[in-house]
């Protein structure tokens, strides 16, 4: 007669994550009388996962009624299955004594779960940088299952090639985790740029997860600055413009300096914004001509996001226009930006 | 699907008997075959069970005077140095026990030891 | 070696009257549940009613149930019917596999 065979047919199964597992197990014999255990994992520090004979296992189950007659089918099913359930499950039968001696193991079966990777998480730099710097962007993802993964980066559409990435651990595990770096080399024309992380796995069905992070984020256009005088009025006074343009984000702060002292201090704020995303901002301002021996040194002085303040002079020439006696009363203050000057 | 039991009858004590357990309708290739027996007027008394070559057992009573084999369709007990409290009907059923218990059963076979 | 004690050893009944029979082992059977109980009649074989302390086997009717774990079981026939007139037997298994004894039998006759 043949001895007792346990036979666990499938070598491998692979389950996605919260789904339920089936793990099979015929013996070709009733005898001896003795009970069927499952494990995990083989050798001393196996993890009994089903005992036919005794206990509750609360999320296993037989696949056939163990206490039917002539039962051979010792299959169990297990629910909800997590990554922490991968493993090679053996299916072994015991003969009846005190204690119940293993007679005989089956050749085991691998589970390995199929977990989705979480939603990509994407982190830029911490501070912003200018145009022509280049700028790190981290994506990670994890817990997912089987290790094998994509990730692709993409900035505006076109791929990025300077990418670094990691998947861990580096062994087998439950569960993997992936961290991806890539190099970003800003240009002024950035602030609606876009960089997406893209992750594909087997568990996604051929849909990508992505992870989004805008340049805005990262990016500091600086100013441009432009200080010029419109044409002497019939009042003796000089129009004095200082045009800012081209810089993000918006904050942002102006201050006149006349000859060297504080006129004015004004702070941008609700600006409107270019096609490029960047913001433009004039300010005015009226010197009366007549009220001054010298020429005025006018400086237009820019803080820009934090950053030290970026300075454009301009000198009036006084002697260029003669005075009336009498005009050193105040002008009228004709605009928001417009100041006169004593 | 039934057992027939032979090769009961007279004998004398200390003599030698060989019971025949055959199956038809199942093969016992894969199931153990147990032996019962029961005195006249008495209850029921476990004796052992048939299995592969290794796995074959007896009460503790019965050790060294009772031994089995067993073939795909048929199942045999071998009893020997007889004595009359041996006199029995034999009955050999399908099954080890526990979850395997025993069904069905042979019709019986009697022995009867006696000089 | 286990030894089971079953009792009453004779009861008289009626038809139609609940009977329930009880099996003691002198110590817990094997994983708690290996008992199982026997009909016989008069010149035949046994038959299988219950195993594993209680699940019922093919083709008995549904009267019969058992019930019980580690030491104490009972078979209960919830209406006796004519032909359940007869001798149960329990069988008791113990931790060692050639460890089966059974019970001395209640013979259930009529009143």
């Known amino acids: 007669e043949e001895e007792l065979q346990v036979i666990q047919p499938e070598k491998s199964v692979s389950v996605a994550a919260g789904d339920s597992a089936t793990l099979n197990c015929t013996v070709s014999s009733l005898i001896p009388v003795g009970p069927i255990q499952w494990f995990r994992g083989a050798g001393p520090g196996r993890e009994l996962i089903y005992n036919l004979k005794e206990g509750h296992f609360p999320r296993v189950t037989p696949v056939s009624d163990p206490t039917k007659r002539n039962n051979m089918d010792f299959s169990i099913r297990i629910s909800n299955i997590t990554p922490a359930d991968a493993g090679t499950y053996y299916c072994v039968k015991f003969r009846k004594g005190s204690p119940d001696v293993e007679l005989k193991s089956g050749a085991g079966t691998e589970l390995s779960v199929r977990a989705k990777p979480s939603a990509p998480v994407v982190s830029g730099p911490a501070v912003r940088a200018t145009a022509e710097h280049t700028v790190s962007f981290t994506c990670e993802s994890h817990g997912f299952s089987p290790r094998d993964i994509t990730l692709k980066w993409f900035k505006n559409g076109n791929e990025l090639s300077d990418v670094q990435t990691n998947v861990d651990p580096a062994g087998k595990s439950v569960s993997y985790s992936i961290r991806s770096t890539a190099r970003v080399v800003l240009t002024r024309r950035d602030v609606h740029s876009q960089v997406i992380c893209e992750v594909a796995h087997v568990t996604l069905q051929g849909d990508p997860l992505r992870g989004t992070a805008n340049l805005s984020e990262a990016i500091r256009v600086p100013p441009f600055l432009e200080v010029t005088q419109q044409s002497m009025r019939a009042d003796n006074q000089v129009n004095v413009t200082c045009q800012v343009t081209k810089f993000y984000p918006q904050r942002l702060q102006l201050t006149w300096l006349e000859n060297g002292n504080v006129s004015r201090t004004e702070m941008a704020s609700a600006l409107p914004e270019n096609k490029d995303g960047t913001y433009n901002w004039t300010s005015w301002l009226l010197v009366n001509v007549s009220a001054h021996r010298d020429d005025v040194k006018l400086t237009c002085q820019v803080e820009h996001d934090g950053q030290p303040a970026v300075n454009k002079s301009f000198s009036v020439k006084v002697s260029a226009h003669p005075k009336e006696q009498g005009s050193n009363t105040a002008a009228e203050n004709t605009g928001t930006n417009e100041r006169n000057i004593y | 699907r039934q057992l027939v039991e032979s090769g009961g009858g007279l004998v004398q004590p200390g003599g030698s008997l060989r019971l025949s357990c055959t199956a038809s309708?199942?093969?016992?290739?894969?199931?153990?075959i147990s032996w019962v027996r029961q005195a006249p007027g008495k209850g029921l008394e476990y004796i052992g069970t048939?299995?592969?070559?290794?796995i074959t057992y007896f009460a503790s009573w019965a050790k060294g005077r009772f031994t089995g084999s067993k073939t795909s369709s048929t199942a045999y007990m071998e009893l020997s140095s007889l004595r009359s409290e041996d006199t029995a009907v034999y009955f050999c059923a399908r099954g080890s026990a526990w979850n395997d218990p025993f069904d069905p059963w042979g019709q019986g076979t009697l022995v009867t030891v006696s000089s | 070696a286990i030894q089971m004690t079953q009792s009453p050893s004779s009861l008289s009944a009626s038809v139609g009257d609940r009977v329930t029979i009880t099996c003691q082992a002198s110590?817990?059977?094997?994983?708690?549940?290996?008992l199982a109980w026997y009909q016989q009649k008069p010149g035949k074989a046994p038959k299988l009613l219950i195993y594993l302390a209680s699940t019922l086997a093919t083709g008995v009717p549904s009267r019969f149930s058992g019930s019980g774990s580690g030491t104490d079981f009972t078979l209960t026939i919830s209406s006796l019917q004519p032909e359940d007139f007869a001798t149960y037997y329990c069988l008791g298994g113990g931790d060692d596999e050639a460890d089966n004894v059974f019970g001395g039998g209640t013979k259930v006759e009529i009143k």
């Open positions: 048939i299995g592969t070559g290794v």
């Open positions: 309708g199942f093969s016992l290739s894969s199931h153990g």
């Open positions: 110590q817990s059977v094997y994983g708690n549940n290996d």
